[in-house]
Every structure is written in C-alpha cells, then in structure tokens.
C-alpha cells in the first residue's frame, strides 16, 4: 500500500526565474488532509524549500513569505517555484503526506531536475 508520487524528470525555469511542474500521487486511502512539501537535494543534503497543508477540495495555501505557489485538483498538485537563480539549479523532490485520517502515508517523488539560467544583462543602449 505504498503511495506512488510522479513528477517530471526535467524542467527549465523561465528567464524570470520561475519553474512550474505537476506532482501527482496515487492515494492508497481516502485522505481529507494532505501535506505537500518541496525538498531540494544537493549532494546528500536535503533541505525544505516550502510546504503547504490542504484539505481535499480546498485550495493549496503556502505561507505568505514562501517562494512557492500552487493549486490542487484531486490527486494532482501544480507547483510553481519563483525567484530562482542559476545557483538554485538542482533536484527538487515532491513529498506528499496523507495526514488525516489515519493511517499516515508517505510518498516521495524521484525529483525534478530544475535548470535555471540567469538572463544576460541588457547592454546599455546609446
């Protein structure tokens, strides 16, 4: 009864440093409360980028100061990460947890490699 999480293998951020991808999970139970976390893995270090808990049927809400936004539809979450720079290029893992009702289930995606290219500065015009 493991929970499978699917996400794209590669995403290219826009020139404005915005990357979007879909995180889809196959729920083994009838969850009413779901937590979605974006993790960044660099070398063997894993850090939390952002997290949001939502009630099924309701909207996904990240904290005001979060670099993430998202929308949810059934077992699918559309995630957007903004403010990315070239140094943020890396593997971004979607983690889904079925929080309520029990039992708890954990689902971890294989990660999305996000490539960020800093835009070239505009040359001064005469």
């Amino acid at each position: 009864k493991a929970m499978h999480v699917a996400q794209p293998a590669v995403v290219l951020a826009s020139s404005r440093g915005i990357a979007s991808f879909v995180c889809e999970y196959a729920s083994p139970g009838k969850a009413t409360e779901v937590r979605v976390t974006v993790l960044r893995q660099a070398d063997s270090q894993v850090t939390e980028v952002c997290a949001a808990t939502y009630m099924m049927g309701n909207e996904l809400t990240f904290l005001d100061d979060s670099i993430c936004t998202g929308t949810s539809s059934g077992n699918q979450v559309n995630l957007t990460i903004q403010g990315l720079r070239a140094m943020d290029t890396g593997l971004y893992i979607c983690k889904v947890e079925l929080m309520y009702p029990p039992p708890y289930y954990l689902g971890i995606g294989n990660g999305t490699q996000i490539y960020v290219i800093d835009p070239e500065p505009c040359p001064d015009s005469d």
């Epitope: 009864k1 929970m3 894993v46 939390e48 893992i93 029990p102 039992p103 708890y104 954990l106």
Partner: antibody, heavy 118, light 108 residues
Framework: QVQLVESGGGVVQPGRSLRLSCAAS????????IHWVRQAPGKGLEWVAV????????NYADSVKGRFTISRDNSKNKLYLQMNSLRAEDTAVYYC???????????WGQGTLVTVSS | EIVLTQSPGTLSLSPGERATLSCRAS???????LAWYQQKPGQAPRLLIY???SRATGIPDRFSGSGSGTDFTLTISRLEPEDFAVYYC?????????FGPGTKVDIK
C-alpha cells in the same frame, strides 16, 4: 549539531502516570515529525507514536492508543509523552527520534528508562 | 500493519567474513521507505541505510543495502570488530512504522 535529550523516566506503579520530555536543538523543530520509540529490556525496537509539524496530527501504535498522548511545543523545541494507566509491559527505554525530511529516523536520543513495577 | 521478519535470528561469523542479513515484509514496501539500523549494547540505534540502498552520512562502504517489494538485504562485505551488533530493518512509508525483530551478528 542535532541533539535530542530525553528526561522524566523512573519507577512507577502499575495504573499510575508518567510524563516524558525530550529537548531538541540544532535543527528547525517545526519542520520535522518527531517520534517516540521504545525498547523493552533485552527486546527489539517498537515504534510508539509520532507528532507531525505543528502538532495537530498524531499517530499511535495500537498497544498504547487511548493510554498515551504525544504532544509538542514548537516554541520551546520540546516533545512530550504523557503515559497513563501504565502496565508492566510498558517497561522499556524510551527514545525520542527525529524523522528526517525523507522519512527515515536519522537522530536518536540516548533514551530514558521507564520501569513499571509494584 | 506491515510485519517485517528478519533472518537469521543470530549470525555467528569471524572478522573479515561477509555477512548477509535478510528482511522480509508481509506486504510490498516501496524501496524508498526501507531503512536499516545498527544497535550496540547500551547504545541508541544508529541509522545505516535508508531508501533500501542509500548509505547514511559517515557509514563505511562495506555496508550496502539492496532489494525491493517484500525482500530486502543488508550486506557487510568484510566484518570489522566494531560491526558485531544487532541490526534492525524498518519500514517508514505508512503508520504504524514497524521494525523487524532484529538479527544479532556475533563473533564465532
């Protein structure tokens, strides 16, 4: 560095109560699920309970459900286990454990011994 | 509840030998959610392997994990004196989070 320090263990009579505490440091406490795992003398490991993130969600082993209550205070980086109606079979070393962001149990406290005996 | 069974219960080997420890689950466990721990007398358990095959920080490469579905293996390629201990497998994909009964690796 990550540290988990348990306290509150001791000898207690069957049917009585005891409250364990765990002081955490070296990490962002509210971003992690924190567990209690116990080990009876000479026996294996048994997961007891977990409290998630803001403390609103908790899960328990069937063996302690209705008798034990796990809680956390994120402002103090502390985890608690309120143990009521204690039985002889609850005698064990109780470990406070951090669930890593990917789910596995990466840091363990040194443990605190609870002995239930008349 | 996922029940984990470990075999053998005790493994008697000499330093330098290879140790193969088995963990079997009562139902399929994603390899992402299977861990191995080492415990020595009087000490807390220590994480060795997570995700069935990833070594935890600071764990020597003589320790390796493998497996999928219901069958998982921990291998110690060449036993060092400090490796004689009890080893537990655990699943952390769903509650209740369960441990195997342990395999004791002792000196022959």
């Amino acid at each position: 560095q990550v540290q988990l320090v348990e306290s509150g263990g001791g000898v207690v009579q069957p049917g009585r109560s005891l409250r364990l505490s765990c002081a955490a440091s070296g990490f962002t406490f509210s971003s992690y699920g924190i567990h209690w795992v116990r080990q009876a003398p000479g026996k294996g490991l048994e997961w007891v309970a977990v409290t998630w993130y803001d403390g609103s969600n908790k899960n328990y082993a069937d063996s302690v459900k209705g008798r034990f209550t796990i809680s956390r205070d994120n402002s103090k980086n502390k985890l608690y286990l309120q143990m009521n109606s204690l039985r002889a079979e609850d005698t064990a070393v109780y470990y406070c454990v951090r669930g890593e962001l990917l789910g596995y149990f990466d840091y363990w406290g040194q443990g605190t011994l609870v002995t239930v005996s008349s | 509840e996922i029940v984990l069974t470990q075999s053998p219960g005790t493994l008697s080997l000499s330093p330098g030998e290879r140790a193969t420890l088995s963990c079997r689950a009562s139902q399929s466990v994603s390899s992402s959610y299977l861990a191995w721990y080492q415990q020595k007398p009087g000490q807390a358990p220590r994480l060795l392997i997570y995700g069935a095959s990833s070594r935890a920080t600071g764990i020597p490469d003589r320790f390796s994990g493998s497996g999928s579905g219901t069958d998982f293996t921990l291998t110690i390629s060449r036993l060092e004196p400090e490796d004689f201990a009890v080893y537990y497998c655990q699943q952390y994909g769903s509650s209740p989070f369960t441990f195997g009964p342990g395999t004791k690796v002792d000196i022959k």
